[in-house]
């Protein structure tokens, strides 16, 4: 009779996390008599998965009735697969021996790869705001996926970005993987309403990619433009001067009026007008009593925006 | 080299409807060269499931790359399994020939059984009502399940019944099965609120049986008991006689008073009193003017309940 062969027909099996994995194994002969065992891995550190003879293996069921005398099928099913179950599984025939059974022949092994979905991508932006024309970095992270192959793209308002760098870790074999990508985005004044999107495609997602988003409103500071103008006189001896603060973001803004360098009034912007692009406008006015001045007066509108260094605009009021 | 063997390790595979079925097949040798095919069934009428050489098989995917020169694994996966896919699948090796390839060797076959859930059980009762102490039949039907093994139990108010007969059709092999069970239930006067339950356990239900119910209120008729009594006189020359109609079900009831066999009044029961057991009570009274009678009067309370033959109770009123 031909010597027993251990047939593991599948070189590899791929299973989605949470499903059951069936690992096929067949013998070509009933002899020599002795049990079979399934191991994950080879060599001294191999892990026992199933022992026909003894032990409790709650996640393992046999496809056939292994107690039947003429059984040649030693396929098993492992329930509730997780990425930690990935590896090469060997069906090993033992012959009876004493004091212990003796390993007789091993199958070629079946590599079990576990398809695990990536976690929802988390996109984070810069710690401090930057102004238009500057470049800021966004990162996108996701974990726990398998296999390693994954595609990541960046978009800004639907337009694909090209300036990014992606790493998948670890570089070698692992039960699951993580991805980390950094995209560099050049800010423009109109970016308050803009959004960056990190999009990931993976075999487990069946063509329905995962997306993580971040709003550029968290990353951008648009400094205001100032314009000081004199309005028509409301009354004799009274000048009305306005400071138009335009196109700033975010909201936080403090304005100080100075008359010839001396602080006249300080106020915090409250009722703002929002522009279509998401920036804000605000106007402040100062009534100057010209009776109190013999000479010309220099009025200065000084604005501190979002904790930055103050900017100012002056206006020379002629006393006629 | 040993002659090629076709190894189908699993004698049987069981798959839930809607899932994919993996059918394992391995060759022990690369020669003779030639394609493999998968068939369902054997003999002249066998059905081609997959042909490695040619054809379009949208539901079939191969586990391995069959185009690789040294491939010995010819396992396939069939998607979206339905009960109609049940059967024995054979992996068949052909050797190249002219004009046609020649069948060389077949695997032993893998029987694919499809686990399909039974439909929700429908319980129906008798077409006509029956009275207590009589036996009525209830039927329970369910369809579309597989495998054939199924357990059906009957309960009345939580107590298991033993007098029933169950058939699973067809008797022979089939892609799916139907069950029909008839239970015989002895009615009691207190059964208006009773319920019969048909409970089915099947491997696909994971220990959570399906139940169908029917209310015995649809099947039972509890005939009334009648009691005619004379009440104390309200006024001289006037006798008050009541007819107490007790413990009947269903509601429909018509009562006729007769004086010495002549119809005095007919009325339909409306405002009923419901008892705890679901039956109803009703009372009717008749005022008899004794001046109009010289001799004794026989008063009869005649009740027609639920379209059945009338029952009556008489009372002799003495004219003093």
């Amino acid at each position: 009779e031909d010597e027993l062969q251990v047939i593991q027909p599948e070189k590899s099996v791929s299973v989605a996390a949470g499903e059951s994995a069936t690992l096929c194994c067949a013998m070509t002969s009933l002899i020599p008599v002795g049990p079979i065992m399934w191991f994950r891995g080879a060599g001294a550190g191999r892990e026992l998965i199933y022992n026909q003879k003894e032990g409790h293996f709650p996640r393992v069921t046999t496809v056939s009735e292994l107690t039947k005398r003429n059984n040649l099928d030693f396929s098993i099913s492992i329930s509730n697969i997780t990425p930690a179950d990935a590896g090469t599984y060997y069906c090993v025939k033992f012959r009876k021996g004493s004091p212990d059974d003796v390993e007789f022949k091993s199958g070629a092994g079946t590599e079990l790869s576990v398809r695990a979905k990536p976690s929802a991508p988390v996109v984070s932006g810069p710690a401090v705001r930057a102004t238009p024309e500057h470049t800021v970095s966004f990162t996108c992270e996701s974990h726990g996926f398998s296999p390693r192959d994954i595609t990541l793209k960046w978009f800004k308002n639907g337009n694909e970005l090209s300036d990014f760098q992606t790493n998948v870790d670890p570089a070698g074999d692992s039960v699951s993987y993580s991805i980390h990508s950094t995209a560099r985005v050049v800010l423009t004044r109109g970016d308050v309403h803009s959004q960056v999107i990190c999009e990931m495609a993976h075999i487990t997602l069946q063509g329905d990619p995962l997306r993580g988003t971040a709003n550029l409103s968290e990353a951008i500071r648009v400094p205001p433009t100032l314009e000081v103008t004199q309005q028509p006189m409301r009354a004799e001896n009274q000048a009305n001067v306005t400071c138009q603060v335009s196109n700033f973001y975010p909201r936080g803004l403090q304005l100080t009026w100075l008359e010839n360098g001396n602080v006249s009034r300080t106020e915090t912007a409250s009722t703002l007008i929002e522009n279509k692009d998401g920036t804000y406008n605000w106007m402040s006015w100062l009534l100057v009593n010209t009776c109190a001045h013999r000479d010309d007066v220099v009025l200065t509108c000084q604005v501190e925006h979002d904790g930055q260094q103050a900017v100012s605009k002056s206006y020379a009021l002629e006393i006629s | 080299e040993d002659e090629l063997q076709v190894i189908q390790p699993e004698k049987s595979v069981s798959v839930a409807a809607g899932e994919s079925a993996t059918l394992c097949c391995a060759m022990t040798s690369l020669i003779p060269v030639g394609p493999i095919m998968w068939f369902r069934g054997a003999g002249a009428g066998r059905e081609l499931i997959y042909n490695q050489k040619e054809g379009h098989f949208p539901r079939v995917t191969t586990v391995s790359e069959l185009t690789k020169r040294n491939n010995l694994d010819f396992s396939i996966s069939i998607s979206n399994i339905t009960p109609a896919d049940a059967g024995t699948y054979y992996c068949v090796k052909f050797r190249k020939g002219s004009p046609d390839d020649v069948e060389f060797k077949s695997g032993a076959g893998t029987e694919l059984s499809v686990r399909a859930k039974p439909s929700a059980p429908v319980v129906s009762g008798p077409a006509v009502r029956a009275t207590p102490e009589h036996t009525v039949s209830f039927t329970c039907e369910s369809h579309g399940f597989s495998p054939r093994d199924i357990t059906l139990k009957w309960f009345k108010n939580g107590n298991e019944l033993s007098d029933f007969q169950t058939n699973v059709d067809p008797a022979g092999d089939s892609v799916s099965y139907s069950i029909h069970s008839t239970a015989r239930v002895v009615l009691t006067r207190g059964d208006v609120h009773s319920q019969v339950i048909c409970e089915m356990a099947h491997i696909t239900l994971q220990g959570d049986p399906l139940r169908g119910t029917a209310n015995l209120s649809e099947a039972i008729r509890v005939p009334p008991t009648l009691e005619v009594t004379q009440q104390p006189m309200r006024a001289e020359n006037q006798a008050n006689v009541t007819c107490q109609v007790s413990n009947f079900y269903p509601r429909g009831l018509q009562l006729t008073w007769l004086e010495n066999g002549n119809v005095s009044r007919t009325e339909t029961a409306s405002t009923l009193i419901e008892n705890k057991d679901g039956t109803y009570n009703w009372m009717s009274w008749l005022l008899v003017n004794t001046c109009a009678h010289r001799d004794d009067v026989v008063l009869t309370c005649q009740v027609e309940h639920d379209g059945q033959q009338a029952v009556s109770k008489s009372y002799a009123l003495e004219i003093s």
Partner: antibody, heavy 120, light 107 residues
Amino acid sequence: QVQLVQSGAEVKKPGASVKVSCKASGYTFGGYGISWVRQAPGQGLEWMGWISAYGGETNYAQKLQGRVTMTTDTSTSTAYMELRSLRSDDTAVYYCAREAGSSWYDFDLWGRGTLVTVSS
Amino acid sequence: DIQMTQSPSSVSASVGDRVTITCRASQGISSWLAWYQQKPGKAPKLLIYAASNLQSGVPSRFSGSGSGTDFTLTISSLQPEDFATYYCQQGASFPITFGGGTKVEIK
């Protein structure tokens, strides 16, 4: 056909040795183990030991350790059981049995038995 | 060593009777139990292996059940040729041990 043929009855004196043979035919001898089981007159079955016909490993019952030796000759598909220092309570029918379980031990094929009588 | 206790030691029954023999192991042996039939002057014959599997060629009136420590051999309808002694045997580990036997006699 598949069978185990044992050697004939033996009469031995106390202190002597006996060697019983068991020839297998009709199956691959090396694929199975052989156990030896004895049965004293009117008594039950007593397992004596086991030998692998493939690798020659043995396992003996504790009470017979040192007195019993089991061997095989794969060229003739024969198993042997030698029992030394015989005593009168060794009088029994000695059976060889093919052990056929894969992960357990049971005996699906038996020889007809060899009667060994120990008497002075 | 694993002790095997068989009961009853003998049973008297008639043709057509249902006969049940029990066997208890002193420790758990999974399903690794066999049942044998022995007639006078003959070698034992394997009836049941792995607690419940019918050996090829054995009539279906013989059946086995149990796992762990308690096992049963049932003869559903006793036939004339079934009058014999029955032994259980644990095959879980060395040393292999047999029960004391149950003699099924004609009533």
